[in-house]
Interface confidence: low
């Protein structure tokens, strides 16, 4: 259904408030360094133009594509070359190359100051003084730091952010009411950003087929009562939504997501019995709720998979006639029977099945050749099961902080070339798998753990892609999306690594560490731990533990001292010397 004016179409579908918010997100995700005021000005200009097109779709320029309109607007920024360097060259290109060029310059780790949370009273005053600007600033700050954040979901976060301030700024104890809510939004927001980043990486690096396979597996687990044709339709629509959002087409994405939610709710009887509550909510909450809905119960008496996919004499005929459809059916049937498997495991099984059929359907006796294909699945299933069991035992024994430290050491030894901040960030997140997943019963552990690890390892991959330093990371990140985790698990100590020169400055600490939050203090200690391993990759657990225990005691002692700075200077020298001796440096 072609519209004379795409911008008018989207403005009418989404409404002015959502239109403005989504354009702001889009611009902030493209031009991540531009000041807030500049973006607001651009958004207002686009909005005014959109209104003229709503009034008269035949007006000048109203027939232009959204990419053309938005790109032209971004290219009016006067400081583009000084601020963004070669990104300014994008403006010399025509659409669609110009948009592709902007997409390639999105920065997963922009050089922006850390967001510091002001005092509660200061925030409440700002909220009351100008609620609209306050909420726009939230969208802007999140979008520029997370250039792939799922835009319609960010509108949902902004709605919750507004609700938190509306409620808590009237409360007797504003801080007690507001701070936990903001912490929750921050943590959920980081998780949401990372999950969406994996979806975009899947689409951009491995293609639509890889994303669709992921979606078939996940939706089949979630909606096991839905028929294959229904799941296929949802997968097609969901792929369109995420392709649009990952491609910067945020207005189309939000519009299509709303349509998909509407379709799901209108057809919930043939999709899932768990959707009723979600479908009673307003649009943003509804879409979020559907995305997070629990798995429906599996239909009773599902027949054995072997009948259709191993025992049948028509396997090769069915495969040859429509390979992707047949493999999609295999994945659907396997996934709906296995909510206890991770999506990536299901995809590995499907890949193994595909590989076997490719080989066997060309063999003299295909049936004999693929008869034992399900036997090949056993080690693939056992590998993540064993890994999760071992790591949950370790987590329960150590607790989260020490478990993170064990992973820090493990990953620094595997890929010591990776920057220390990246190793700390990624290992801390990997370590959170313990508290997130190990509490679950066996049947929920693997989907929780391995699919979460896929998200975290993707963070490592996108950060490493910006500044590649390790061939091993590149190999694990680029060879196979579903085998990233096993690839990293299989890495041993990098024997080719030349230890870093010892630099006492790295291990010099000051009194400011005493005023840090517990989390920030942990990060300081974990940064030191990574550096230690980089200096002495062959250090034993016992040696590292001894040095870290000394370090903890040193910080505790100096933070209690009257003259903290002198204590840090003098005791620090002793600690460095003792650590060097302990590690044989």
């Amino acid at each position: 259904d072609a519209h004379k004016s795409e911008v008018a179409h989207r403005f009418k579908d989404l409404g002015e408030e959502n239109f403005k918010a989504l354009v702001l997100i889009a611009f902030a995700q493209y031009l991540q360094q531009c000041p807030f005021e500049d973006h607001v000005k651009l958004v207002n200009e686009v909005t005014e133009f959109a209104k003229t097109c709503v009034a008269d779709e035949s007006a000048e320029n109203c027939d232009k594509s959204l990419h053309t309109l938005f790109g032209d607007k971004l290219c009016t920024v006067a400081t583009l070359r000084e601020t963004y360097g070669e990104m300014a060259d994008c403006c010399a290109k025509q659409e669609p190359e110009r948009n592709e060029c902007f997409l390639q310059h999105k920065d997963d780790n922009p050089n922006l100051p850390r967001l510091v949370r002001p005092e509660v009273d200061v925030m409440c005053t700002a909220f009351h003084d100008n609620e609209e600007t306050f909420l726009k600033k939230y969208l802007y700050e999140i979008a520029r730091r997370h250039p792939y954040f799922y835009a319609p979901e960010l509108l949902f976060f902004a709605k919750r952010y507004k609700a938190a301030f509306t409620e808590c700024c009237q409360a007797a104890d504003k801080a007690a009411c507001l701070l936990p809510k903001l912490d929750e939004l921050r943590d959920e927001g980081k998780a949401s950003s990372a999950k969406q980043r994996l979806k975009c990486a899947s689409l951009q690096k491995f293609g639509e087929r890889a994303f669709k396979a992921w979606a078939v597996a996940r939706l089949s687990q979630r909606f096991p009562k839905a028929e294959f044709a229904e799941v296929s339709k949802l997968v097609t629509d969901l792929t369109k939504v995420h392709t649009e959002c990952c491609h910067g087409d945020l207005l189309e994405c939000a519009d299509d997501r709303a349509d998909l939610a509407k379709y799901i709710c209108e057809n919930q009887d043939s999709i899932s019995s768990k959707l009723k509550e979600c479908c009673e909510k307003p649009l943003l909450e509804k879409s979020h709720c559907i995305a997070e809905v629990e798995n429906d119960e599996m239909p009773a008496d599902l027949p054995s998979l072997a009948a259709d996919f191993v025992e049948s004499k028509d396997v090769c005929k069915n495969y040859a006639e429509a390979k992707d459809v047949f493999l999609g059916m295999f994945l659907y049937e396997y996934a709906r029977r296995h909510p206890d498997y991770s999506v990536v495991l299901l995809l590995r099984l499907a890949k193994t099945y595909e590989t076997t059929l490719e080989k066997c359907c060309a063999a003299a006796d295909p049936h004999e050749c693929y008869a034992k294909v399900f036997d090949e699945f056993k080690p693939l299933v056992e590998e993540p099961q064993n890994l999760i069991k071992q790591n949950c035992e370790l987590f329960e024994q150590l607790g989260e902080y020490k478990f993170q430290n064990a992973l820090l050491v493990r990953y620094t030894k595997k890929v010591p070339q990776v920057s220390t901040p990246t190793l700390v960030e990624v290992s801390r997140n990997l370590g959170k798998v313990g508290s997130k997943c190990c509490k679950h019963p066996e049947a929920k552990r693997m989907p929780c753990a391995e699919d979460y690890l896929s998200v975290v390892l993707n963070q490592l991959c996108v950060l490493h892609e910006k500044t590649p330093v390790s061939d091993r990371v590149t190999k694990c990140c680029t060879e196979s999306l579903v085998n990233r985790r096993p690839c990293f698990s299989a890495l041993e100590v990098d024997e080719t690594y030349v230890p870093k020169e010892f630099n006492a400055e790295t291990f010099t600490f000051h009194a400011d560490i005493c005023t840090l939050s517990e989390k920030e203090r942990q990060i300081k200690k974990q940064t030191a731990l990574v550096e230690l391993v980089k200096h002495k990759p062959k250090a034993t657990k016992e040696q590292l533990k001894a040095v870290m225990d000394d370090f903890a005691a040193f910080v505790e002692k100096c933070c209690k001292a009257d003259d903290k700075e002198t204590c840090f200077a003098e005791e620090g020298k002793k600690l460095v010397a003792a650590s060097q001796a302990a590690l044989g440096l």
Partner: antibody
Framework: EVQLVESGGGLVQPGGSLRLSCAVS????????MTWVRQAPGKGLEWIGT?????NTNYANWAKGRFTISKDSTTVYLQMNSLRAEDTAVYYC????????????????WGQGTLVTVSS | DIVMTQSPSTLSASVGDRVTITCQAS??????LAWYQQKPGKAPKLLIY???TVASGVPSRFKGSGSGTEFTLTISSLQPDDFATYYC????????????FGGGTKVEIK
Amino acid sequence: EVQLVESGGGLVQPGGSLRLSCAVSGFSLSRYAMTWVRQAPGKGLEWIGTITTGGNTNYANWAKGRFTISKDSTTVYLQMNSLRAEDTAVYYCARGGYVSYADATELSLWGQGTLVTVSS
Amino acid sequence: DIVMTQSPSTLSASVGDRVTITCQASQSIGSRLAWYQQKPGKAPKLLIYYASTVASGVPSRFKGSGSGTEFTLTISSLQPDDFATYYCQSYDYSSSSSYAFGGGTKVEIK
């Protein structure tokens, strides 16, 4: 120590059979695919076949029917039947990819090879 | 089946020379290509995998490049230990021939 040791080579008459063994140590066959490769005197490398972690086999077209790969917990075997003079070669076993790669991978670890001579 | 064509079959060079060996696949294999070095009477040794990734313990003078059907192994400055035969190998499990080796390139002293 991670290593592969081939054995079972020797002189065999045309039309005869031979079974080569590849003993592995330092890793588990349930986690790695194993491949047999041969090299005729003065010639290049030639892939024979591969056995996956689950025991499925994949052969070069020329090897199908005469060559069979199997394994137990620590050893990989190559059964060669109806041998011909042109099968004279050094036979190597090599370790392929980690279990979770459904695809084939590079051969990162090789045995020292065992010589098979087919002659009357 | 995939056929790997390696050239040249023999190459005469001196210590310090920059040496280039090429390998052509009969159909696209993405980046699924490995390079091996073999010395007389010894087993092959993995040098490069995934077209450009240098294997553990291999000197940095060895460099792999290419994707699709055209691949290159470059030795930036030939050392005495580098005189050997080099093989390329595709590994594509989706084809009926999982592994296909090139014919080899013998690098000898000029």
